[in-house]
């Protein structure tokens, strides 16, 4: 099939006092090969500080996955979700505290 670029969605949730969990979800993409990782100050976080979901079919012939990490509240601007798929790439910031969703569809 032809390439379908992912929809990327960054959310945040309270983790513990002073910390938040930020989750980057990529959905509705094809083929299934994708790089999704959190970057801190432009550098990819080490693997042991991130949690990844499996790349799973979403029922429409496309795929979905996610990556999450825990960060200190107030440090959000230093973190970006990096996505690379079929030769295209994009970076996605953590939404501010009053905006819990950040959607981008990449073509």
């Amino acid at each position: 099939g032809s390439t379908v670029p992912p929809m990327v969605n960054v959310t945040r949730s309270e983790a513990s006092e002073g910390n938040i969990t930020v989750t980057c979800r990529a959905s509705s993409f094809y083929p299934r090969n994708i790089i999704l990782t959190w970057r801190q100050d432009g550098v990819s976080l080490s693997h042991d500080t991130q949690q990844w979901g499996d790349v799973l079919p979403d029922g429409n012939g496309t795929y979905q996955t996610w990556v999450a990490t825990r960060i200190c509240r107030g440090e959000e601007q230093r973190f970006t979700c990096y996505m690379e798929h079929s030769g295209n790439h994009s970076t996605h910031p953590v939404p501010s505290g009053n905006s819990h969703h950040h959607h981008h569809h990449h073509h």
């Epitope: 801190q40 100050d41 432009g42 550098v43 990819s44 976080l45 080490s46 500080t49 200190c72 230093r78 030769g87 790439h89 970076t91």
Partner: antibody, heavy 121, light 108 residues
């Protein structure tokens, strides 16, 4: 004024160990990632290691992985590079360099004057 | 790891001449994560061009940068004496971070 001052270089025998230090001043050390970069005599720049501001992310060049350890003491504004199993090819000027973040761009904005390490018998 | 090969290794240019050097990566690098540094003998490197094409503060407008994927270049529109230096490309798209092999620009 931002200042990075390296120390600890000198002459070491092959197989020996050495610990380099980088003393920082003039900025809030605990909010910046720092790198070690080296330059062999008459050669180019070689990235050695990186430690994020909170020490949660650490990376090494393949040439030093397993032999060098980067660490930092934020309360003392000091960066370290513990080097073991030293080889002649580790002979170089070692720089510490601050990793800036400005407007979504990250880059080396301040460098120390360097400390020279010579590995020779 | 991503290896960055710069060419030529050394070049001589006359004053006023247009100079172009290249940086070739073994795998694709996002332009956001590709910078150029200038280093003069006895001095630490200085950020020269960031994110492939943006001039750092204080860099003369005769410099420009371009490229994408595995091929990047730095151009000096009209060589001046103060431009004699070694230029390094640098990527942090993938860890380990790497510098290019360097291009030394001399005055002919």
């Amino acid at each position: 004024d931002v200042q990075l001052v390296e120390s600890g270089g000198g002459l070491v025998q092959p197989g020996g160990s050495r610990k380099l230090s980088c003393a920082a001043s003039g900025f809030t050390f605990s909010t910046f990632g720092i790198h070690w970069v080296r330059q062999a005599p008459e050669k180019g720049l070689e990235w050695v290691a990186y430690i994020s501001y909170d020490s949660r992310t650490i990376y090494y060049a393949d040439t030093v992985k397993g032999r060098f350890t980067i660490s930092r003491d934020n309360p003392k504004n000091t960066l370290f590079l513990q080097m073991t199993s030293l080889r002649s090819e580790d002979t170089a000027m070692y720089y510490c360099a601050r990793w800036a973040y400005e407007g979504g761009v990250n880059y080396f904005d301040n460098w120390g004057q360097g400390t020279t390490l010579t590995v020779s018998s | 790891q991503i290896v960055l090969t710069q060419s030529p290794a050394i070049m001589s240019a006359s004053l006023g001449e247009r100079v172009t050097m290249t940086c070739t990566a073994t795998s694709g690098v996002s332009s956001s994560y590709l910078h150029w540094y200038q280093q003069k003998p006895g001095s630490s490197p200085k950020l020269w061009i960031y994110s492939s094409s943006n001039l750092a503060s204080g860099v003369p407008a005769r410099f420009s940068g371009s490229g994408s994927g595995t091929s990047y270049s730095l151009t000096i529109g009209s060589m001046e004496a103060e431009d004699a230096a070694t230029y390094y490309c640098h990527q942090f798209h993938r860890s380990p971070l790497t510098f290019g092999t360097g291009t030394k620009v001399e005055i002919k």
